[in-house]
Structures are given as C-alpha cells and as structure tokens.
Interface confidence: medium
C-alpha cells in the first residue's frame, strides 16, 4: 500500500501514468481514481468503463499495464491519481501517482531599479519581473553565474571595475521549462539598450 | 581609507545573549554587502553570516541559523549581529568583513572576542 | 559543500626561501573563484589573491597564485621577514563560502 510516485509535466503535454511494477497476474478489477474517490475509469472482466468526469474523452486505459494516458493536461488536473487493483484472491493492492502541471515561465523582464557610480565601482539593482510565478532565479553576468546568495527576483551587488560585466541575463525557470532576459549596459556603469 | 571596527564581544554564560556591532567607515556602506566571519581560539575561519546592501536578503551557515540574527542601520553605517542561546562552541573572534561583488571579504575589522563559558 | 584541504599544515623556513602551498578543493571550484588570505598572530586576516591568480591591491609581486578546477597554489618567490603568518585559501564558487584549514609558515 502507500507506493507513491511524483510526476511533474508541462501543462498542454500527453501524459502516461503507469507504475515500475508488473500488475499481479490475473487480477479480477483495475480502477484509477482522482482525488481518491472520483473514479476515472474502471477495467472489469475484459472491459473498460470510463465515468463522468473532466477527463472524459481525455483518457484511455491499457489494461494490459494499466497505464492510463492522459491527452493535453491542465493544472487544474494537479492531483493524487490511485490506481487499485482488486486482486483474484480477494485482496486489493494500490499505487499513488501525484501529478504536477506546470505552466510555461514566461519571458521575464529586467527592471533596472537603480545604477550609479559608487566610490569608483559600480551599484546595481535589478529586478526580474514576471507574472506571480513559483520560480527559480539564477542571473548571469556576461554568462558568468552569479553566487547563490544572489538567486532571487531581485540582484543587488556592487561590482568594482575588473568585475564588471556588459550584459546581466536572469533566467528564471521550474521544473520544465526556463526562459531568459537580459540587459546590456555601456561600461562600466550605464545603460545602454534592453 | 575603508575601515571597520567591531565591538559588543565579551564573556557570556551558554544559554546567554549578545549583540556585536561594526562600525563601518571610508566607504558608501548602504552599496556593499556585509558579513560575519568568526574564528574559534587557535582554529581557522568560519563564515558565518551575510546581509545584502539594503538589508532586504540574509543568509546564516547552518550552524547559527535560527540564533543568530545580521541586520544593519545604514543611516548609522553599522552592521550587527544579534545572538541568542549561545554555545560554548559560538566562542570566537568574530570579525565583520566587506564583501567584494558578493565574492571574497576585503577588508576585514579587527575582531571582537566572544567567550562563552560558565 | 565544498572541502579545501591545505597542505602542509605547517613549513619552517628562512628568509630568501621559495614557498608553495597547496589548497585542494572536494569537488571542482567554478571558474577559479579562490582567494589566499594572509593571517599574523592578533591580526586579521588580509587578502592576498582573488580569482586564483589577481593579486589584491598593494600586495607585493613575490606573492602569485595559480590553478583551477580542484587543485591551486599560492607562491611565495622569496620569503620576507614579514612574510611568517597563517595562510588561508577561500572558495567563493559556491555557498556557503568554505575556507581552508591554514597552512602555517614559520621561521626555521
């Protein structure tokens, strides 16, 4: 009981749940279920039987390793997905899958929150601004990675002239896509175009 | 010429609490990152903690975190480092240090010593 | 989190001499962000080198650094009086900053 997987996948993808494990041999039912008690479609002696739900149409069953497919999900389809199998000696074994939809980050944009020229070095602060997304922040100067300390939506440093960089890049990404924006300045502490 | 000064180290019993402070000078402070670095009698340097420029982001080794608290004044241009439920093993010199561009530390202040014992 | 280990813990030596020191890194320091303090009894510490090889401002030529990736050096080309201290090799690579344990350099 209890074997639970995590599956992240790219909102509009086809999606394939299935488990690692070969399904007991000559089990009398297999249903899969959303949000433990919503059956999505059931096999029983050698048919399929799919019920009213929002995957209805989206969904097809191979009972042969009771994967389930599932075409064009949406986040709205983020959930615990339980396929249980009712096994010929009466006993019913189960497998969790809890499926994550992600959206595609958008294309950020760097705000330049300020830069000026500070005892001979140069003081910048950079926001990288996107709609309200849960991402990660990793910026770059001139390709190099900046520290991790710096990885949020916000890069605030002080760079002395042989540190310098022309371009500023924040990539912000999840766990299935990522996207960049960049900012080049005239050197050593100026903008020059977006 | 950049200079730092700590102050606020002294004796204090475990369990106890104590607050640093570094006095910054030579410098547009507000633009720099700051940082704690300590070291134990005899033994080598353990970063400790740091604060971004305008104090909005912090960072803590795992060893302090959760009991010790960086924050600055940058009307005052002083950093401090707060530090509750000390430890035997928080006895150090602990110096505040410049950071350069979020890298290395340049300079460094004096150091001010922290014993913590019964 | 990133281990350097500096060998040897200590050299004796005498003015004039030539002095290597090695700070390896557990695992590859990302476009050589390693720094070499120099530490004197009651002191704090003062940088060295930045970047493997840059040497900070008013450090003396005879003070070069090199290496990349796990293994660096911090050379000494003839030992000064002022020279005998603690030194101490920093990654600043990844987080958290990880430090060396310090090879000590002592008059013979």
């Known amino acids: 009981q209890g074997h639970l997987v995590h599956m992240t996948v790219v909102s509009g993808s086809n999606v394939t749940l299935n488990i690692s494990e070969s399904l007991p041999e000559n089990y009398k039912q297999l249903t899969w279920f959303y949000t433990f008690d919503q059956k999505i479609v059931e096999w029983d002696s050698r048919k399929s039987k799919y019920f009213e739900s929002k995957f209805k149409g989206r969904v097809r069953l191979d009972p042969q390793s009771g994967a389930l497919y599932i075409s064009k999900v949406q986040k709205e389809d983020n959930s615990t997905y339980i396929m249980r199998v009712l096994k010929k000696t009466g006993n019913e074994q189960e497998w969790k899958i809890k499926l994550q939809v992600l959206d595609p980050v958008p294309k950020p944009v760097i705000k330049i929150e300020k830069i000026e020229d500070m005892d001979d070095n140069c003081y910048l602060k950079l926001s990288c601004v996107i709609p309200g997304e849960s991402v990660n922040y990793t910026w770059y100067g001139d390709k190099r990675p900046f520290p991790k300390e710096l990885q949020n939506s916000v890069l605030e440093t002080t760079l002395m002239p042989h540190n310098y960089s022309r371009c500023y890049t924040c990539q912000v990404s999840n766990s299935v896509s990522s996207k960049n924006g960049t900012v080049c300045l005239s050197p050593p502490c100026t903008l020059a175009r977006s | 010429e950049v200079q730092l000064v700590e102050s606020g180290g002294g004796l204090v019993h475990p369990g106890g609490s104590l607050r640093l402070s570094c006095a910054a000078s030579g410098f547009t402070f507000g633009g720099y990152a700051m940082s704690w670095v300590r070291q134990a009698p005899g033994k080598g340097l353990e970063w400790v903690s740091l604060i971004s420029g305008s104090g909005g982001s912090t960072y803590y080794a795992d060893s302090v975190k959760g009991r010790f608290t960086i924050f600055r004044d940058n009307s005052k241009n002083t950093l401090y480092l707060q530090m509750i439920s000390l430890r035997a093993e928080d006895s150090a010199v602990y110096y505040c240090?410049?950071?350069?561009?979020?890298?290395?530390?340049?300079?460094w202040g004096q150091g001010t010593l922290v014993t913590v014992s019964s | 989190e990133i281990v350097l280990t500096q060998s040897p813990g200590t050299l004796s030596l005498s003015p004039g001499e030539r002095v290597t020191l090695s700070c390896r890194a557990s695992?590859?320091?990302?476009?050589?962000?390693l720094a070499w303090y120099q530490q004197k009894p009651g002191q704090a510490p003062r940088l060295l080198i930045y970047g493997a090889s840059s040497r900070a401002t008013g450090i003396p030529d005879r003070f070069s650094g090199s290496g990349s990736g796990t293994d660096f050096t911090l050379t000494i080309s003839r030992l000064e009086p002022e020279d005998f201290a603690v030194y101490y090799c920093q990654q600043y690579g990844s987080s958290p900053r990880t430090f060396g344990q310090g090879t000590k350099v002592e008059i013979k």
């Open positions: 695992q590859s320091v990302s476009s050589s962000y």
């Open positions: 240090a410049k950071y350069s561009n979020y890298d290395y530390f340049d300079p």
